[in-house]
């Protein structure tokens, strides 16, 4: 069971300082941006991180949404990352959900975050280069200290 608490507005970056944004095709991508680029590209660079109470002791449960014309929420259904047109629900009556991730602070690196899927244990949001694009994907942690699954989260409120 997950019960919605509060939300905050955040900018999410990978460890190469590229900013996460949602493109015109609703794809989550990373790109080099100055602070003014980041502001100019809002609301596509501003993510709504909604926090949830979890009935089990597993960590800080969150959903990640974006509001362009409508609100879309990040999903990892079938281990494929996509934004689905939906509001983060107030309650989820299950112990797993494709839209719930556990936001974890990496021990020894307070400012570095990981997002682990509640549906697929051991799978994390990651940045992966595919041709010329830096994509947000779901990835099984395959090596210790994998930088691709670490992010910084900057609160905007």
């Amino acid at each position: 069971y997950f019960g919605k608490l509060e939300s905050k507005l955040s900018v999410i970056r990978n460890l190469n300082d590229q900013v996460l944004f949602i493109d015109q095709g609703n794809r989550p991508l990373f790109e080099d941006m100055t602070d003014s680029d980041c502001r100019d590209n809002a609301p596509r660079t501003i993510f709504i991180i909604s926090m949830y109470k979890d009935s089990q002791p597993r960590g800080m449960a969150v959903t990640i949404s974006v509001k362009c014309e409508k609100i879309s929420t990040l999903s990892c259904e079938n281990k494929i990352i996509s934004f689905k047109e939906m509001n983060p629900p107030d309650n989820i009556k299950d112990t797993k959900s494709d839209i719930i991730f556990f936001q974890r602070s990496v021990p020894g690196h307070d400012n570095k975050m990981q997002f682990e899927s509640s549906s697929y244990e051991g799978y994390f949001l990651a940045c992966e280069k595919e041709r010329d694009l830096f994509k947000l994907i779901l990835k099984k942690e395959d090596e210790l200290g994998d930088r691709s699954i670490m992010f910084t989260v900057q609160n905007e409120d």
Epitope: L5, K53, P57, R58, G59, M60, R104, S105, V106, P107
Partner: antibody
């Protein structure tokens, strides 16, 4: 780097209560669980319970301590408290607060410990 | 009530490799991650290994963790005198809905 600073040593009489504080500095206090763990002289570690200040002060206590321990937090001062009542001599121990930022059960930062002595 | 079983003591000469075992059951280690803590004499415990085999930054790669079934182990290679400490394993126990520690293992560097 987060630091957890605990209150000083206490000497208490059997049957009384003790309240130990744990002040966090240098990090986001309300996002993480704070656990309390005790260690009797020459013994191992024993988990007492936790509070998630972020989760509107949600608490969870180990069965052994239920009804005798109360864990609270004051977000305005980034301080967690552990109060243990009906003290007995076997409660003589060092009491540690420990922060969990990665997972509620991964104690990645510890206070220096507070020695509580229960003696008549 | 100690739910996770560790040997009370282990020892090794400088430069050697030692392992510390931690035995549990399906209600704890068998279905949950294991963490390890180091407690140097007179100090608070310190996180050494989390999630079975992850090292926090600052922990030397001489320390490694592993898990198999209902048991876990901590390996220390290239033993140094400053490794002399108590080591505790920790896991979550579903039957008691509580986090549990092993009884601790005292490592002596000969």
């Amino acid at each position: 780097e987060v630091q957890l600073v605990q209150s000083g040593a206490e000497v208490k009489k059997p049957g009384s209560s003790v309240k130990v504080s744990c002040k966090a500095s240098g990090g986001t206090f309300n996002s993480y669980a704070i656990s309390w763990v005790r260690q009797a002289p020459g013994q191992g570690l024993e988990w007492m319970g936790w509070i998630n200040p972020f989760y509107i002060g949600e608490t969870f206590y180990a069965q052994k301590f239920q009804g005798r321990v109360t864990i609270t937090a004051d977000e305005s001062t980034s301080t967690a408290y552990m109060e243990l009542s009906s003290l007995r001599s076997e409660d003589t121990a060092v009491y540690y607060c420990a922060r969990a930022a990665y997972h509620p059960l991964v104690f990645d930062n510890w206070g220096q410990g507070t020695l509580v002595t229960v003696s008549s | 009530d100690i739910v996770l079983t560790q040997p009370p003591s282990v020892s090794g000469a400088p430069g050697q490799r030692v392992t510390i075992s931690c035995s549990g059951s399906s209600s704890n280690i068998g279905n949950h991650y294991v963490n390890w803590y180091q407690q140097l004499p007179g100090t608070a415990p310190k996180l050494l290994i989390y999630r079975n085999n992850h090292r926090p930054s600052g922990v030397p790669d001489r320390f490694s963790g592993s898990k198999s079934g209902t048991s876990a182990s901590l390996a220390i290679t290239g033993l140094q005198s400053e490794d002399e400490a108590d080591y505790y394993c920790q896991s979550w126990d579903y039957s008691g809905f509580s986090t549990v520690f092993g009884g601790g293992t005292k490592l002596t560097v000969l």
